[in-house]
């Protein structure tokens, strides 16, 4: 999981200040015992900061040591700081845990920029604002790192929620969620509601605010409106999905749909941006520029570098288009679309202009490793990682930031033929050449 550009976006307040909360709609789906309903103890259990990640509180060891852990659906290791580091307020002290077991094995994880390395072991782990269970899980005790921890981010470790296939050092290291499901009665499913604030938060605001919810083992109706639409998980490694069509303000990009998934498309809470393959990114930016041509922005803005600032409260959301991604549906020849607003893909940035201005970064960027549906996408939606049924669900998030004219949307069904052809088949490569970091 890559840093800088790969760490999640921002937290927000559950009530989506400066935006509007959508009214609750009645629920049409039948109850599935143990999987749906109310998970009050888990609602609002995430916090975070713009561009620096959403984190959950976890306890490790006996007696329990409390740590804040980044929630990352784009990796599969549970790894925590285990040695002093200038950016860590606290770290896991294995010598103080009576239940720690050393696996006598090292792990080294390089990223495109930066790396971490550590020692593998197991210990007892629980999530205070999660299911009332304790599990013995694999833990990578990070002893050395470079450009991994972020100054002021307030998290001390990472919870990789993807599948064993991409675990380091190899797929024999059971990920935390697999251990949780095996050792308890928690259903094999979790869901995420990441709440972007729509404006930058300072450190004290972050600590006092809600960043969203991670519901472990179920779906909470209060976190979304309308219906949940599901797309198949194509392969259990990353949370890989298939995009079959892309529209900018309703205008089809008209590309071979394989391009959208070259070389894969994944849902990744550990990435800030919506990242698109080079050809797709170029076509999308061209289309977004054309749609917003009443104003011209510098080249560096479209590269995600320069920030554009407007007088506070006057951001011209209306000149920016909505972006729709059509995802393969569960039924043959059926797709559905998720639509995000500029309120999701223009990321508020703090501390750069005066307090009288609102400044934003363009949070869509180029990728050489496929499409990454990062926090920019996820902040619009309640996302259900239904591992048991090998599918990912999307519904409009009850906390997404919008205005009085447009809201994020999840709509369907649409007839789409030959969707299987949209998937790219990655040539079989030796495991060691798999790149962890995404450039």
């Amino acid at each position: 999981t890559q840093h800088g550009i790969r760490l999640p976006l921002r937290s927000g307040l559950g009530g989506a200040p400066l935006g509007l909360r959508l009214p609750r709609e009645t629920d049409e789906e039948p109850e599935e015992p143990g999987r749906r309903g109310s998970f009050v103890e888990m609602v609002d259990n995430l916090r975070g900061k713009s561009g620096q990640g959403y984190y959950v509180e976890m306890t490790v060891g006996s007696p329990p040591q409390t740590l804040n852990i980044l929630v990352d659906t784009g990796s599969s290791n549970f790894a925590v700081g285990a040695a002093p580091h200038p950016f860590l307020h606290r770290y896991y002290q294995r010598q103080l845990s009576s239940t720690y077991r050393d696996l006598r094995k090292g792990v080294y994880v390089p990223y495109t920029q930066g790396k971490w390395e550590g020692e593998l072991g197991t210990d007892l782990v629980s999530i205070p604002h999660g299911p009332n269970v304790t599990v013995r899980a694999n833990i990578a005790a990070i002893t050395e790192s470079d450009k991994f921890f972020i100054n002021g981010s307030n998290w001390e470790g990472i919870l990789g929620l993807a599948y064993a296939e991409i675990a380091r050092p190899d797929d024999s290291l059971e990920p935390f969620f697999d251990s949780l499901v095996k050792q308890t009665h928690v259903p094999n499913l979790f869901s995420l509601q990441l709440c972007g604030a729509g404006f930058p938060l300072n450190q004290s605001e972050v600590l006092a605010s809600v960043g969203g919810s991670m519901i472990i083992g179920g779906i909470d109706h209060s976190l979304y409106t309308g219906s949940l639409w599901y797309t198949p998980i194509r392969r259990e490694w990353y949370y890989e999905v298939i995009i079959v069509r892309v529209e900018i303000n309703g205008q089809d990009l008209k590309m071979d749909c394989k391009e959208y998934n070259y070389d894969k498309s994944i849902v990744d809470s550990g990435t800030t941006n919506l990242r698109l393959p080079k050809k797709v990114f170029e076509a999308a930016v061209k289309s977004i520029k054309a749609a917003s041509s009443t104003e011209k922005f510098p080249d560096g803005f479209w590269l995600g570098e320069q920030l554009v600032c407007w007088q506070a409260g006057t951001t011209p959301w209306n000149i920016f288009p909505v972006i729709s991604l059509y995802l393969m549906g569960e039924v043959t020849n059926q797709s559905f679309r998720i639509t995000i607003l500029p309120q999701q893909y223009l990321r508020p940035v703090e501390d750069v202009a005066t307090s009288q201005d609102d400044c934003y970064k363009f949070a869509i960027s180029q990728s050489s490793t496929g499409t990454v549906m990062g926090a920019v996408i996820m902040e619009g939606f309640y996302v259900v990682f239904d591992r048991a049924r090998k599918r990912i669900g999307f519904a409009v998030s009850a906390c997404h930031v919008h205005d009085e004219f447009r809201t994020a949307a999840v709509e369907g069904p649409f007839v789409t033929l030959d969707m299987e052809d949209c998937g790219y088949n990655i040539p079989q490569t030796d495991e060691s050449t798999l790149m962890t970091g995404r450039a």
């Epitope: 009443t294 510098p298 560096g300 320069q306 750069v352």
Partner: antibody
Framework: QLQLQESGPGLVKPSETLSLTCTVS??????????WGWIRQPPGKGLEWIGS???????YYNPSLRSRVTISVDTSKNQFSLKLSSVTAADTAVYYC????????????WGRGTLVTVSS | EIVLTQSPATLSLSPGERATLSCRAS??????LAWYQQKPGQAPRLLIY???NRATGIPARFSGSGSGTDFTLTISSLEPEDFAVYYC??????????FGGGTKVEIK
Amino acid sequence: QLQLQESGPGLVKPSETLSLTCTVSGGSTSSSSYYWGWIRQPPGKGLEWIGSIYRSGSTYYNPSLRSRVTISVDTSKNQFSLKLSSVTAADTAVYYCARVGHGISYFDLWGRGTLVTVSS
Amino acid sequence: EIVLTQSPATLSLSPGERATLSCRASQSVSSYLAWYQQKPGQAPRLLIYDASNRATGIPARFSGSGSGTDFTLTISSLEPEDFAVYYCQQSLTWPPRTFGGGTKVEIK
């Protein structure tokens, strides 16, 4: 060769409105490649950005002057203008118009500037 | 707000000497920094943009370097016409708005 020329009264009374026009020759204010801006420099002091405008009329202003500034563009006349209301002696400065080029990030061509004195 | 601090305020040198001017940003501006030259009674002139690119018609003795928060304008060998005030300007935040306070290069 593109040139910019500021014009307007050199003396304005306190509380009145300062009005300046920048005429662009050898180029066009309707170009999609540039913004057009105003910068001022009080005597013996540094440069202060006032605001910028695009051909569509989209404007950006310095927050410290925003309540008093209006910038407009007339592409048919190849001109853009500055109005600064409720002036005081602190607004006495050389006022420059400039083209914002190089990826619309820098002031790559400037007018010669015009001194505006606020005095009764 | 990003603040640009230029140093020294005044640099006293002789023709033929090397001039090194500094511009420090209060936070990273990546490479979005320009240098301008202003002679008495004249408008500023763009010298360097994007930290190190010379603008059209600018002599090779002018060079810019740096990224992030620390930037340098170097004049390799001062010519008589180079004695002027030099300003830096950042455009990480757009539209371009923030200038440094200036460095005066005067004849020793």
